[in-house]
């Protein structure tokens, strides 16, 4: 061993970098001796600008170390990622992104909300981390069910909608005119019969939002990425399970004229009892027998399920019957109804507790004689399909 010391030169004493220490500390370092550098918490080993997890240098025969000592640099989490539909504020100081710096994410007020508090800290692993330990960005979820509409409007028997009344209303243009309801910033709820045959021919489906006038040249355009028709729906064999979802290629920006309708809460059933009033809007046929130019709406009461089923037994609709997956709305004497061209639109109700509107029904079918006495409008009962809707959205 003594000979081994003389055969090679000792290496110079290593100097610990600022905010770091060396181990082991020895009086001398000779051939094959090594040392490692460790940084204080909140600092990392950097060789230039490149991070290292560990550093060990070995003493060589010529009395030099085999690599240069890196620096211990303060952890820099870097500029935080942009938050879609939100923004970030630097709390610690302008553009400060180093260890223990704090930032605050916020969503665009009024139209988006965040479930967490949005506070993130630059931690020792170099990631912006929330108080719950999450390293992913918070999510700005669209607010749903806000409307300037107040119940009491007297598109059969209806009246014109005003801007912001039905911001979830979606116009579907294909071979025929239909409607849908925005339920997320990239999902539209509609009737299966309105999009039947569109699962493959999606490019023929023109989706428009943020409009009142059906023929308006100023609108927000969306295109379908996928169409999901309920597996229990059979085209031409009644309207049971008449529900579908359209996944949009791109998220739409939420504003006062484009906003999702809320899905019903578990308590929604108590708000949709017989004689409770819902509202439906659409560009479908009016009393005059033509498609409406302006978005029309009507407030209509829910009809007793048995009464509705009986009415359609007396005056059957070819190939259709009222099932438990449907709800009916209208007046015994008639005069208020949805009609052809309204299909897929939402029958909505105000949740008094949250003061938000939610979708209870989807315009599905009814007598050819829209608004006729005891010819109630039949709607897909959305509360029966919440698991189906959530399953598709969550698994897409």
């Amino acid at each position: 061993h003594h000979h081994h010391h003389h055969a090679s030169q000792p290496c110079p004493d290593p100097t610990a970098p600022p905010n770091g220490h060396i181990s082991p500390v020895q009086a001398t370092y000779v051939l094959k001796d090594s040392f490692s550098v460790f940084c204080k918490t909140g600092f990392e080993l950097l060789q230039g600008s490149v991070p290292l997890k560990s550093f060990t240098a070995v003493c060589q025969k010529d009395g030099s170390w085999d690599r240069p000592i890196p620096e211990c640099s303060i952890i820099d989490c870097g500029p935080p990622d942009d938050l879609p539909n939100g923004h970030v504020d630097y709390i610690t100081g302008p553009e400060v992104t180093t260890y223990k710096a704090v930032i605050q994410y916020s969503c665009e007020e009024t139209f988006y909300t965040m479930s967490s508090n949005g506070k993130y800290v630059c931690e020792a692993d170099g990631f912006w981390t929330s108080s719950k330990g999450e390293k992913s960005l918070p999510v700005c979820k669209p607010v749903c069910g806000l409307s300037t509409h107040t119940s009491g409007g007297r598109i059969i028997g209806g009246q014109p909608a005003k801007p912001g009344d039905f911001p979830w209303q979606v116009l579907l243009l294909g071979e025929t005119t239909a409607a849908g309801a925005l339920i997320h910033d990239d999902w539209v709820l509609t009737a299966a019969h309105a999009v039947y045959g569109k699962t493959e021919a999606m490019s023929s489906l023109d989706i428009r939002m943020g409009i009142l006038k059906r023929l308006s040249l100023i609108y927000t355009q969306a295109w379908p990425e996928a169409v999901f028709i309920h597996e229990g729906y059979t085209h031409g064999a009644g309207f049971d399970n008449d529900i579908a979802l359209i996944k949009l290629k791109n998220k739409v920006t939420i504003n006062r004229n484009i906003m999702p309708i809320c899905l019903p809460r578990k308590e929604a059933a108590s708000l949709m009892k017989t004689d409770f009033v819902g509202t439906v809007a659409g560009w479908g046929l009016t009393q005059k027998g033509f498609l409406a130019r302006n978005l029309m709406f009507v407030d209509i009461p829910i009809v007793d399920h048995q009464k509705c089923a009986t009415a359609y037994t007396k005056q059957p609709y070819p190939g259709a019957k009222v099932t438990v997956n449907m709800l009916c709305a209208g007046l015994d004497r008639g005069g208020k109804d949805s009609c052809r061209g309204d299909a897929g639109g939402a029958l909505v109700f105000l949740d008094n507790e949250t003061q938000r509107w939610f979708v209870g029904g989807i315009v599905s079918w009814g007598s050819i004689n829209c608004g006729g006495s005891e010819q109630y409008g039949v709607y897909t009962k959305v509360t029966n399909y919440i698991p189906w809707i959530e399953n598709i959205i969550n698994n897409f």
Partner: antibody, heavy 114, light 107 residues
Framework: QMQLQESGPGLVKPSQSLSLTCTVT?????????WNWIRQFPGNKLEWMGY???????SYNPSLKSRISITRDTSKNQFFLQLNSVTTEDTATYYC???????WGQGTTLTVSS | DIVMTQSQKLMSTSVGDRVSVTCKAS??????VAWYQQKPGQSPKALIY???YRNSGVPDRFTGSGSGTDFTLTISNVQSEDLAEYFC?????????FGSGTKLEIK
């Protein structure tokens, strides 16, 4: 012996996305170092695109920041390059390499053409 | 971005000669410079890191020197297999940048 191997399509159309995989054998990508993507244009100009470090942190060339994403799958010991909205200017040989550049893949040639 | 300038695009030398390839950084990069050798049809191979530290397996006829802005790769006793293009790279500051390359031809 440590090796890096790039894989991906040889041809991509303009405006599409490019996805490349670097499979590392003989060394765990979580053990240490930064794992880089570097490309070499016709004429031999080299450009560093970005890296993903042992901890999963990324650093990108600002000239590509809006289009690039580097991710990894630690269970497969792979890291990935995604480059969006490619143009003919992205035609190059793409290499994955370990810092200090002591190990490089053999490169994969990408042509962007309609 | 830091610009790494290799002013000599092509250098001619003979077997057994000593040749120096230079690289200039547009700003101070300390010793955070690497040198690569690329032979035709091959991927680059690391020769030197941190300005003067030889990578393992690299013949000791390759020597790196310099700090700050001026760096040199010296090949003493040039061999025919050294016919290649040589690139410098700074890793001091992101983005990491490369020189444009110097081709070495053997007379």
């Amino acid at each position: 012996q440590m090796q890096l191997q790039e894989s991906g399509p040889g041809l991509v159309k303009p405006s599409q996305s490019l996805s490349l995989t670097c499979t590392v054998t003989g060394y765990s990508i979580t053990s240490d170092y930064a794992w880089n993507w570097i490309r070499q244009f016709p004429g031999n100009k080299l450009e560093w695109m970005g890296y993903i470090s042992y901890s999963g942190r990324t650093s990108y060339n600002p000239s590509l920041k809006s289009r690039i994403s580097i991710t990894r799958d630690t269970s497969k010991n792979q890291f990935f390059l995604q480059l969006n909205s490619v143009t003919t200017e992205d035609t190059a040989t793409y290499y994955c390499a370990r810092h200090y550049g002591d190990y490089w893949g053999q490169g994969t040639t990408l042509t962007v053409s309609s | 971005d830091i610009v790494m300038t290799q002013s000599q695009k092509l250098m001619s030398t003979s077997v057994g000669d000593r040749v120096s390839v230079t690289c200039k950084a547009s700003q101070n990069v300390g010793t955070n410079v690497a040198w690569y050798q690329q032979k035709p049809g091959q991927s680059p191979k690391a020769l030197i890191y941190s300005a003067s530290y030889r990578n393992s397996g690299v013949p000791d006829r390759f020597t790196g020197s310099g700090s700050g802005t001026d760096f040199t790769l010296t090949i003493s006793n040039v061999q025919s297999e050294d016919l290649a293009e040589y690139f410098c790279q700074q890793f001091n500051t992101n983005p990491l940048t490369f020189g444009s390359g110097t081709k070495l031809e053997i007379k």
